[in-house]
């Protein structure tokens, strides 16, 4: 069996065995090693010498196997745009930014560039659940039957009405989309404004 070629090695068809960790160098028609994440090319390869890599300086990074002669500059997240760092930049990874909780991404250019506050959903409604959270503003939908939500909030969920009988109580006033059922002790008289409803 043929020995495995080690960079630099000649390539007639302009392709390399390991596309992730090697690249084709057209000047010499050879395959050379890429530099691993966190490093850059400090000396290019030749027919007799493979790529020489060096570690990225502080506040710079390269995320992938590469043949870049520089490292990318770390960029801070912009809190004015609602973005916040959730993990710092390292030599192998750029600063990880995310919209602050309760915000959604309002502008996207390869990555999020601007976040805005989620709109409140008024009483009687809740935010429709999305497959991908943080990608769009709230769309408020009415509480389904038998549920209520009594605040203006971007995140409050509709809750089921209390079932008075489960607590050994009776219903004094039915629940609405904006309020829970009112329960009372079965021995208590109804409030005066409801006393007329006892007939039949």
């Amino acid at each position: 069996s043929q020995p495995q070629a080690v960079p630099p090695y000649a390539s007639e068809n302009q392709t390399c065995r390991d596309q992730e960790k090697e690249y084709y160098e057209p000047q010499h028609r050879i395959c050379c090693s890429r530099c691993p994440p966190g490093t850059y090319v400090s000396a290019k390869c030749s027919r007799i010498r493979d790529t020489v890599c060096a570690t990225c300086a502080e506040n710079s990074y390269n995320e992938h196997w590469n043949y870049l002669t520089i490292c990318q500059l770390c960029r801070p997240c912009d809190p004015v745009m609602g973005l916040e760092e959730i993990a710092p930049c390292t030599s192998k990874r750029k600063t990880q930014c995310r919209c602050q909780p309760g915000m959604f991404c309002a502008a996207w250019a390869l990555e999020c560039t601007h976040c805005e506050l989620l709109s409140d959903c008024p009483p009687g409604t809740e935010a429709e659940l999305k497959d991908e959270v943080g990608k769009g503003n709230n769309h408020c939908v009415p509480c389904k039957a038998g549920h209520f939500q009594n605040t203006s909030s971007p995140s409050a969920r509709c809750q089921p009405h209390t079932r008075c009988e489960n607590q050994g109580l009776v219903e004094a006033a039915p629940g609405t989309a904006q309020s829970d059922t009112t329960c009372k002790n079965p021995l208590e008289p109804l409030p005066p404004e409801m006393s007329g409803t006892m007939l039949m």
Epitope: P76, C77, P79, E84, E85, I86, A87, P88, Q96, R98, Q100, P101, G102, L118, L129, K130, D131, E132, V133, G134, P154, S155, R157
Partner: antibody, heavy 115, light 107 residues
């Protein structure tokens, strides 16, 4: 190196008040949400309160709303928690944490509520 | 509020074991989830953010997966220093919430 140092804990009677502080260094304080998290002895972690980077938005867990007030001074790199009407169930170690995903934590300050 | 339900609440394992801890959110949180390790008398330390991204300096035996409502923390080969309590936390929306914790003890 990020450092978060809490102070202000102590023994207080039920109904009493206490002001906790957190001194931050080693990062751009004004770029991060800052939070208070508490942990009662032998219990789990509970988020208490948070404040947005500019200080314009504050958030609280339901059990402390109306009793606790979070504030920050971006010029001095400090985070405060004013606690009033303290209850026995508020007794815990209170820890200051950087960022809404709690990237870094302080060591905490103990709050004891007892008569 | 988003409830985070962690299971199991405790487990016994031996060095070298593969350990899996699960966390379920009461509603979808996309990938806005972190995992923390806490040892007695110490502050928590974050291991994973965005559900699956490993924090700098955290050993590669730790990994996270999941999206939406179901998440997993896996320790591929438990080491002596991994005996601790682990918490999940969602940061999709306020109030920020933690799971109840999973104590990993020596068998």
């Amino acid at each position: 190196e990020v450092q978060l140092v809490e102070s202000g804990g102590g023994l207080v009677q039920p109904g009493g008040s206490l002001r906790l502080s957190c001194a931050a260094s080693g990062f751009t304080f004004s770029s991060y949400t800052m939070n208070w998290v508490r942990q009662a002895p032998g219990k789990g972690l509970e988020w208490v309160s948070g404040v947005a980077p500019s200080g314009d938005r504050t958030y609280y867990t339901d059990s402390v709303k109306g009793r606790f007030t979070i504030s920050r001074d971006n010029a001095k790199n400090t985070l405060d928690l004013q606690m009033t009407s303290l209850r026995a169930e508020d007794a815990a170690i209170y820890i200051c944490a950087q960022g809404f995903a709690f990237t870094n934590w302080g060591q905490g300050t103990m709050v004891t509520v007892s008569s | 509020d988003i409830q985070m339900t962690q299971s199991p609440s405790s487990l016994s394992a031996s060095v070298g074991d593969r350990v899996t801890i699960t966390c379920r959110a009461s509603q979808g949180i996309s990938s806005a989830l972190a995992w923390f390790q806490q040892k007695p008398g110490k502050a928590p330390k974050r291991l994973i953010f965005d559900a699956s991204s490993l924090d700098s300096g955290v050993p590669s035996r730790f990994s996270g997966s999941g999206s939406g409502t179901d998440f997993t923390l896996t320790i591929s080969s438990l080491q002596p220093e991994d005996f601790a309590t682990y918490y999940c936390q969602q940061y999709n929306n306020y109030p920020l919430t933690f799971g109840g914790g999973t104590k990993v003890e020596m068998k």
